[in-house]
């Protein structure tokens, strides 16, 4: 891997498991104020595999609000607006990092957590299940 | 909002900007060992709006590797396997949290950063722009 010289201005770490426990500045850089995905694009409605967005809230997590996509139909919407069951609407999932308060209810101590979220849906050709 | 009593076992914070700077345990909980999205599903190939996955690596970021989706076509794949330009392949984007080493090259000091990533693509009905 790439070896990067350590910056002499780095904070010291007294943690024996260094760098397992690190200092994190929560002043978010590159902040995008638009956190409601419904406002950022209307793809969820215009897609051939449309989805609904469900608000998932957890005060013990940062960010506390995550939007989860749920595909509206089993099939995909065709040119006539009907559901075509020769195709499948499927969720596109992504693993994201969140901060989980640990110990619980602590304002300044967290643990990194990976969670799988559904971001939207896409239309795919199905794998046909043949009867045994 | 919900008021949660502070856990008496929380670590103390000497940071004047508390809780702007927090302690984070990097031992990831709920770790999903399958980090290569190509292995987790073949939707990127089976979709009517297929996409390619590009590896974005940055040693100053955690996670250092992020996969970015790029739609293969402007249009969508129809039942005959041809590109239908009456429809559009568009990226589904999501804002995710990453940790950025700050000051640079420091192993145990980070700042939270929000970045916009393309997770996959979906097929949408285009917005037709009429000439005035």
């Amino acid at each position: 891997g790439i070896t990067i010289p350590r910056n002499p201005g780095c904070p010291n770490s007294e943690d024996k498991n260094f760098p397992r426990t690190v200092m994190v500045n929560l002043n978010i850089h590159n902040r995008n104020t638009n956190t409601n995905p419904k406002r950022s694009s209307d793809y969820y409605n215009r897609s051939t595999s449309p989805w609904n967005l469900h608000r998932n809230e957890d005060p013990e997590r940062y960010p506390s609000v995550i939007w989860e996509a749920k595909c509206r139909h089993l099939g995909c919407i065709n040119a006539d607006g009907n559901v075509d069951y020769h195709m499948n609407s499927v969720p596109i999932q992504q693993e994201i990092l969140v901060l989980r308060r640990e110990p619980p209810h602590c304002p300044n101590s967290f643990r990194l957590e990976k969670i799988l979220v559904s971001v939207g849906c896409t239309c795919v050709t199905p794998i046909v299940h043949h009867v045994a | 909002g919900i008021t949660i009593p502070r856990n008496p076992g929380c670590p103390n914070s000497e940071d004047k900007n508390f809780p702007r700077t927090v302690m984070v345990n990097l031992n990831i909980h709920n770790r999903n060992t399958n980090t290569n999205p190509k292995r987790s599903s073949d939707y990127y190939n089976r979709s009517t709006s297929p996409w390619n996955l590009h590896r974005n690596e940055d040693p100053e970021r955690y996670p250092s590797v992020i996969w970015e989706a790029k739609c293969r076509h402007l249009g969508c794949i129809n039942a005959d396997g041809n590109v239908d330009y009456h429809m559009n392949s568009v990226p589904i984007q999501q804002e995710i949290l990453v940790l950025r080493r700050e000051p640079p090259h420091c192993p145990n000091s980070f700042r939270l950063e929000k970045i916009l990533v393309s997770v996959g693509c979906t097929c949408v009905t285009p917005i037709v722009h009429h000439v005035a």
């Epitope: 099939g75 559901v83 069951y85 020769h86 499948n88 199905p126 | -």
Partner: antibody
Framework: QVQLVQSGAEVKKPGASVKVSCKAS????????MHWVRQATGQGLEWMGV????????RFNQKFTGRVTMTRNTSISTAYMELSSLRSEDTAVYYC??????????WGQGTTVTVSS | EIVLTQSPGTLSLSPGERATLSCKAS??????VAWYQQKPGQAPRLLIY???TRHTGIPDRFSGSGSGTDFTLTISRLEPEDFAVYYC?????????FGGGTKVEIK
């Protein structure tokens, strides 16, 4: 003409399973999805789920997730709905219905399932 | 899930009269609404789909209207065979749901 013929009435004990069949004729079976809807005596209609007769994939009402299975046999143009861990509240008439244009145009005659100890 | 509320619960009318049945959705369902008629001991029968399109063989005294959250089924002149229970159903998003029904009975 299009016809959906369902299997006969069933009496089951609580905790048991029931499998209802729906034989289609008069059209190409794999061209239309099949829905399952139930109706308790004197009550309204309740959507249970839908199966793509083409792929075999299904989507259920969350209320039944883990208890319902929907399958199909394309060679005999038949769809099946199996409900397990039966309870008295599952006593109802179960219908299969073909989907067309975001609606259910043809329905089976219904299968009465009685759950009683 | 999307909740469909039908009103009135019961409509008492005489043959020849006009029947107006309402169906309200808890959220916007565009025009993805169907109407069914059910008689005792029978399976439901499709009348209207896409909120306003009559199904094949349905008499033109049946008409549907509405979009978004408010939908109406109108029977312009009630015939004796029209006395039944009517259900609306949304096909906008799974789980697809039905209204509680409106019973049209002879006055």
């Amino acid at each position: 003409q299009v016809q959906l013929v369902q299997s006969g009435a069933e009496v089951k004990k609580p905790g048991a399973s029931v499998k209802v069949s729906c034989k289609a004729s008069g059209y190409t079976f794999t061209d239309y999805a099949m829905h399952w809807v139930r109706q308790a005596t004197g009550q309204g209609l309740e959507w249970m789920g839908v199966i793509s007769t083409y792929s075999g994939d299904a989507r259920f009402n969350q209320k039944f997730t883990g208890r319902v299975t929907m399958t199909r046999n394309t060679s005999i143009s038949t769809a099946y709905m199996e409900l397990s861990s039966l309870r008295s509240e599952d006593t109802a008439v179960y219908y299969c219905a073909r989907e067309v244009r975001r609606s259910m145009d043809y329905w089976g005659q219904g299968t009465t399932v009685t759950v009683s100890s | 899930e999307i909740v469909l509320t039908q009103s009135p619960g019961t409509l008492s009318l005489s043959p020849g009269e006009r029947a107006t049945l309402s169906c309200k959705a808890s959220q916007d369902v565009s025009t993805a609404v169907a109407w069914y008629q059910q008689k005792p001991g029978q399976a439901p029968r499709l009348l209207i789909y896409w909120a306003s399109t009559r199904h094949t063989g349905i008499p033109d005294r049946f008409s549907g209207s509405g979009s978004g959250t408010d939908f109406t089924l109108t029977i312009s002149r009630l015939e004796p065979e029209d006395f039944a229970v009517y259900y609306c159903q949304q096909h906008y998003s799974t789980p697809y749901t039905f209204g509680g029904g409106t019973k049209v009975e002879i006055k």
